[in-house]
Amino acid sequence: MGRARDAILDALENLTAEELKKFKLKLLSVPLREGYGRIPRGALLSMDALDLTDKLVSFYLETYGAELTANVLRDMGLQEMAGQLQAATHQGSGAAPAGIQAPPQSAAKPGLHFIDQHRAALIARVTNVEWLLDALYGKVLTDEQYQAVRAEPTNPSKMRKLFSFTPAWNWTCKDLLLQALRESQSYLVEDLERS
């Protein structure tokens, strides 16, 4: 093992001082799996990235520690880092657009991604395409792709163009799109999740 620990440390060392502070505060309130305790606040707040990694691994073991770290990073809006942390711990495969490492393709993620399940509905019902493009720009979409989607005349044709790039995306890339949809049209996502 050891890979998960290294990946946690790498993620934490790639947080700025402000982000590390925010990470610790979120760790104090993040929901935990049954049977796991919380790292004491006093000890937690004074730790550097290395100490915190050791503490996370000793409290939660490597696998759950990595998962918990990824959850907190995601909660901080750092989807890309969370995805890369999971990539490093699971060693997945598949194409990785515009600077995102490939996460596990199927581990604990059976079936189609939400984005693929609801492709037709999203093409028909997404209205705030510009928001999605800005959220994905430089992370999942290259400059060329971004411009190609923007050039389309209507929202459905923009979405259709956006979906033309998704076959090359991995799970993390699709998560970024889903996250952007939650931020821009949460009611639509909720509606589709219920359907």
């Epitope: 790639n14 880092m81 990539a87 060693q91 490939a102």
Partner: antibody, heavy 118, light 107 residues
Framework: EVQLQQSGAELVRPGSSVKMSCETS????????LTWVKQRPGQGLEWIGY????????EYNEKFKDKATLTSDTSSSIVYMQLSSLTSEDSAIYFC???????????WGQGTTLTVSS | AIQMTQTTSSLSASLGDRVTISCRAS??????LHWYQQKPDGTVKLLIF???GLRSGVPSRFSGSGSGTDYSLTISNLEQEDIATYFC?????????FGGGTKLEIK
């Protein structure tokens, strides 16, 4: 300790190709991207492209799309860059660097000097 | 492509000085800005990542700040070993681009 060791200097003829290497150690090779950067004498840095060695995915700077080809050998933890149809404009120092989680280049090789001359 | 501009190509300062090197992007780069040091022997090293994150092992006299399009690297107490060329780089959008560099010399 993370280390990136690049191959030695090359002197080649115009029109030919060259393949330089970047040998990595001290980390899990397949969980990171490796990127390449060009520096002409006395000039700035230009990003060429990157490869994710875990799956072979590549992205190139449009400017280098027909010039550079990035490949990797996971069994030996080495990344290669092949440059084709060489001209004097390709004479430069080429650096490999590991791609960090913020898309920064967190460890750098020492550079490979390429001289294209007849 | 996003243009990165370091308006000062060379800078002279005295040991112990506080030195600030600036970098401007042609559009908002949302803090995806990193600083590198290239020593006279050619070796390159990451100093600051994501605007303000100090790379482990880099002396605390180095700091980074900025937002939007304007960013800066500050060396609070210049030492002889800081003589080098400093480059900024954006990674918000492909192709990733560097500033032209600022060469720091001792007065």
């Amino acid at each position: 300790e993370v280390q990136l060791q690049q191959s030695g200097a090359e002197l080649v003829r115009p029109g030919s190709s060259v393949k330089m290497s970047c040998e990595t150690s001290g980390y899990t090779f397949t969980t990171y991207g490796l990127t390449w950067v060009k520096q002409r004498p006395g000039q700035g840095l230009e990003w060429i492209g990157y490869i994710y060695v875990g799956n072979g995915y590549t992205e190139y700077n449009e400017k280098f799309k027909d010039k550079a080809t990035l490949t990797s050998d996971t069994s030996s933890s080495i990344v290669y860059m092949q440059l084709s149809s060489l001209t004097s404009e390709d004479s430069a120092i080429y650096f490999c660097a590991r791609l960090g989680l913020r898309r920064h280049f967190d460890y750098w090789g020492q550079g490979t000097t390429l001289t294209v001359s007849s | 492509a996003i243009q990165m501009t370091q308006t000062t190509s060379s800078l002279s300062a005295s040991l112990g000085d506080r030195v600030t090197i600036s970098c401007r992007a042609s559009q908002d780069i949302s803090n995806y800005l990193h600083w590198y040091q290239q020593k006279p022997d050619g070796t390159v090293k990451l100093l600051i990542f994501f605007t303000s994150g100090l790379r482990s092992g880099v002396p605390s006299r180095f700091s980074g700040s900025g937002s939007g399009t304007d960013y800066s690297l500050t060396i609070s107490n210049l030492e002889q070993e800081d003589i080098a060329t400093y480059f900024c780089q954006q990674s918000i959008l492909l192709p990733w681009t560097f500033g032209g560099g600022t060469k720091l010399e001792i007065k």
